[in-house]
């Protein structure tokens, strides 16, 4: 997260760290007791590595009573996700067992009504991604509030030049932005999950390259079918 601040500890009990061989790889969001939603591209280079999900965490390194690492029983990328596109960049991870819920671990309601969030709406994005252009990784969860950007502006040639489909949304990126390592994390508007940080190699913090988020409402049928 660029231009953000340290989050209040455990105030986002839905927040997950998707880990590869014990190290933070991507963000994720608990959407059901046994399911975490993240980004499909996160596992592209995972190969034979061990993928796990950390829940109930604020610090990645310090011991915390609520922290627990779960193995992954099943990883389900969206069937239409492809390595070279930002489209359909969703991944559902089934935990090896139901998460132990509590004040620091709780699923987040997700948007099912397929309607765009109004431009200018302030939404919260959180993650353990890099916090500066030098690539410094934080130990504790960071967050930032970002205004939603209208799709027409996001589709301008100097922005994302027509790449933003109806199944994607954008948020402003003027110094405050999601960045590498935040992919798969939640964009939360009015206490509801609206978007998932896409995992392209986008430049961060440049206002002409807005953050791109996959709209979960557009994938409600797929999410329901996997969770069923």
């Amino acid at each position: 997260i660029l231009g953000g601040r340290e989050a209040e500890a455990h105030a986002r009990p839905y927040m997950a760290s998707v880990q590869l061989n014990g190290a933070h790889l991507c963000g994720g969001v608990l959407v059901a007791e046994q399911w975490v939603l993240s980004a499909a591209h996160c596992l592209e280079d995972a190969a034979d590595g061990k993928v796990q999900v950390l829940l109930g965490a604020h610090s990645l390194s310090q011991p915390e009573p609520s922290k627990r690492l779960y193995d992954v029983l099943r990883a389900v990328p969206h069937p239409d996700s492809q390595p070279d596109t930002i489209d359909h960049d969703l991944l559902l991870l089934q935990l090896s067992e139901k998460a132990t819920l509590g004040p620091a671990v709780r699923p987040l309601p997700w948007q099912r009504v397929d309607r765009d969030v109004a431009p200018g709406t302030l939404c919260d994005v959180a993650g353990w991604g890099i916090v500066n252009h030098a690539g410094r990784r934080p130990d504790s969860l960071q967050h930032v509030l970002l205004p939603v950007l209208d799709r027409a502006t996001c589709n301008r040639r100097t922005h994302h030049d027509g790449a933003i489909t109806e199944r994607l949304m954008c948020a402003e990126s003027n110094r405050r932005d999601s960045c590498k390592g935040d992919s798969g994390g939640p964009l939360v508007c009015g206490g509801v999950l609206e978007g998932v940080v896409t995992s392209g190699s986008r430049v961060c913090g440049n206002r002409k390259k807005p953050g791109i988020y996959t709209r979960v409402a557009s994938y409600a049928a797929w999410i329901d079918s996997v969770l069923a």
Epitope: A152, N155, T158, G162, A163, I164, E166, N206
Partner: antibody, heavy 116, light 112 residues
Framework: EVQLVESGGGLVQPGGSLRLSCAAS????????MNWVRQAPGKGLEWIGD????????DYNADFKRRFTFSLDTSKSTAYLQMNSLRAEDTAVYYC?????????WGQGTLVTVSS | DIQLTQSPSSLSASVGDRVTITCRSS???????????LEWYQQKPGKAPNLLIY???NRWSGVPSRFSGSGSGTDFTLTISSLQPEDFATYYC?????????FGQGTKVEIK
Amino acid sequence: EVQLVESGGGLVQPGGSLRLSCAASGYTFTDYYMNWVRQAPGKGLEWIGDINPVTGDTDYNADFKRRFTFSLDTSKSTAYLQMNSLRAEDTAVYYCTREGPSFAYWGQGTLVTVSS
Amino acid sequence: DIQLTQSPSSLSASVGDRVTITCRSSQTIVHSNDDTYLEWYQQKPGKAPNLLIYKVSNRWSGVPSRFSGSGSGTDFTLTISSLQPEDFATYYCFQGSHVPVTFGQGTKVEIK
């Protein structure tokens, strides 16, 4: 299939007004800026300006700012170009073109002739 | 405003010829996001322009590989490696990096 269809061109006297329409189909109208470009007979392409179909924000080439105005009817997926105080040198084919990707999609153009 | 100057203004060539059109801008067209929004359009009489190349060197969908773009800063080139009958048209460069966006004056490619 993305389609842009202009209409409203024709013969108008110097000093007169005309409103051109650009009807869009095959995509969500509010997801892309609309630009207007004109081409005088035997001449090159000249950018008039653009409009954001969500906010209505406009940007005009300084040469057109005083006499030309963009508007929208999102319920009809249509953009409009209102041209006032027309002069002989405004005689041209007027195009609308969607921005994103680049100017990949254009209308067929509509001819405006300013003559007495 | 940024001026784009194309050369030549017109040229005569034969089918199979290699054709090069240049476009020079009055100032750099590198955008603040580090991309260069230099595009090339082809226009045939009575028709709307067609996008050929975007961001200096990227071919638009369906554009034949004989069309290529290159350049940086202020100097750009459109090359047609082997001219085909359907390529006789007018070609325009365009910069979208700075408002007002601008077109070159055009290069007419005619049959020799």
